[in-house]
Amino acid sequence: IWELKKDVYVVELDWYPDAPGEMVVLTCDTPEEDGITWTLDQSSEVLGSGKTLTIQVKEFGDAGQYTCHKGGEVLSHSLLLLHKKEDGIWSTDILKDQKEPKNKTFLRCEAKNYSGRFTCWWLTTISTDLTFSVKSSRGSSDPQGVTCGAATLSAERVRGDNKEYEYSVECQEDSACPAAEESLPIEVMVDAVHKLKYENYTSSFFIRDIIKPDPPKNLQLKPLKNSRQVEVSWEYPDTWSTPHSYFSLTFCVQVQGKSKREKKDRVFTDKTSATVICRKNASISVRAQDRYYSSSWSEWASVPCS
Amino acid sequence: RNLPVATPDPGMFPCLHHSQNLLRAVSNMLQKARQTLEFYPCTSEEIDHEDITKDKTSTVEACLPLELTKNESCLNSRETSFITNGSCLASRKTSFMMALCLSSIYEDLKMYQVEFKTMNAKLLMDPKRQIFLDQNMLAVIDELMQALNFNSETVPQKSSLEEPDFYKTKIKLCILLHAFRIRAVTIDRVMSYLNAS
C-alpha cells in the first residue's frame, strides 16, 4: 500500500481467482483513543472499533472511503483504491491503446517547436467518475523540472456505438534551451482513477522526436504574366522556433487534381516558394518538417487553384 | 528570407555543403546499423545517450545563434579555449565567437574520427563480419575537417591489446552513431545559420 495523495491510498493486488489479497491496517488520524468506530462509504454498518482497523483487501467491494467516527462526529477518512496486476502486468483498462506509433501506446505527445513546451493526449470511453493527474520531469534518476497544467477534456467523438473522450495536458520544461542536444528523455507520468480503480501510464521521449510543426502560414498564389503558371509562396508558421536560419524547415509541395484518383504531383523544397501550373479545380498543398531531424510532418496548408 | 540551396555558390559559406553531406552520411550509417544489428539494443529508446565530447568541447554553447544568447537556459558557464584560424571563415569580420564555434566543431569531428577508426579496426577482426563503418561517412568527416582547416595536434588512433568484445563494440557503435547524428544536426543548423548571416 502507498499514499497517492493525502488520505488516498493505493493497494496493489495480484488479480487472479481466489487470490489472498492484501492485509491493510488503517489508523484513525485523531488523538482520541476510545469510542472510535469505522464505516465504509455511505453504509452505516460498523466494520470495527478502535483506533486501527485491519482489513483484507481482495476486490473492489473492499475498496472505498473508510471513515472513523466518534459519537456521530467524523474524525478522518482514508480512501482505498485498487491497482490490479494480472499475470505480472499492471492493468490498462481506463485508457485506450492508440496503437500509434506502436502497440501499447496510451499517451501521445507532440511539440510544435524546441521551446520545451509539449502537449500530451490520451483516449478513453469512460465518461464519468474519472480523474487524471500528470507529472513530468527531464530524466528520472536526477530529475529536472517540467511543469504540467491540469488535464482537460479536449474532444469528444462518436466511434460506432461508443463515445470516445480525448483528454490533453500542456507541459513546459522549466529551463529549456531550444538549441540544446538532449541526452536525457522527458518522462511523463499520468495517474488515472476511475471510481475505485487506479492505473498509471508513462511515456518517455526526447522533444526532438515528438516535433510536429504547425502548417505553413500565408499560403498564397500569384499569377505569372502571360502564363498559366502561378507563383506559390508560403511562410514559416509563427509557432516555429527562431531564428529560422538555424531551425530550418523543409517543405513538401503537392498538386492534386479534382479527382482523388488522379495521381498527385509533389516535390520537396527548402525554399518558401515554387512555380506551379494551376489547373481548374486542382488544389495546391504545402506541409513542413524540420530540415535536419526528420520527425513528423505538419498538417497540410491548402489553397484551391480557382 | 530563403536560405540558398545546398550547392555552394561562389562566396557561399564553404562548409554548408560538407555539413549537409555529413548529416546524410551519418543518418544512412545509423539506419544501416539499426537494420543490421536488429537483435542488438540499437534504437534511440534502447541505448544510453553518451556524448564523447562532453567537457572537452562546447559546440552548442560556442555556436549558439545570437538570438538565443538572451536565453539564460542556453548559456553555460563552461569555457573552452580554441584555436582561431580556419578556411570556413568567410571574411575578416568573422567574430571571435564564430572562430570558437568552428574550431569546436573541428574538435568534435576529430574525436569522432578517432573513435570510428578505432572501432572499425575492431569490427574488421570480427569473424561474423557483420557490420563495418561506411567509408563514405569517414571520407565526409575528413572533407569537412579539411574545409574547416584548423591546425591541431593529431590524436593517435587508440590501439588495444586485449581481445575485442564484439558485442560491446557493436553496442558502442550504436551509441556513437546516435550521438554523432545529433551533433551532425547541430553542425548543419550552425552552418545554415552562418551561411544566412
Epitope: 503558371q229 523543409t250 509541395v253 498538386v255 495521381k263 504531383d265 509533389r266 516535390v267 520537396f268 523544397t269 527548402d270 525554399k271 515554387a274 512555380t275 506551379v276 501550373i277 489547373r279 | 540551396v5 545546398a6 550547392t7 549537409q20 553531406n21 546524410r24
Partner: nanobody, 125 residues
Amino acid sequence: EVQLVESGGGSVQVGGFLRLSCVGSGRTLNMYNMGWFRQAPGKEREFVAAISGKGLISDYRDSVKGRFTISRDNARNTMYLQMNSLKPEDTAVYHCAAGQWSAGPFTRERSYEYWGQGTQVTVSS
C-alpha cells in the same frame, strides 16, 4: 538504369536564346523529378531549374527567373530548358539530371541519381 543525353547547346550573342533538350532512356521518367545544373570553368556545379514528375511544379535559380523556362514532355521522355535573354554569366556546361521525387529537395544536386554528360552553352558579347 537511366541514361540521359543533352542537346541544343551552342554559342550565341548576349540577348540571344537557346533551347536545351534532355532525352531519357532505359526507364519511364514520369515518376522522376528532373533538373538542369550548370558548371562554369573553375566553379562549383550549381542549380539552374527543376521540375516535378508530372511537370506541374518547378523552381528556378533567382538569377534566371523570368528568362528561363523548364518544361517536360513525358510522352517523349524529354525535358526542355528554354533560355531567353542570355547573358555572359550563363556560359557553362549544362547538365540534366533525374531523381526519385522522395530523394530530397528538388533544387539540391544530391537529390539526383542520374546525370547526363552535359552540353556547352557559350554567351559572348
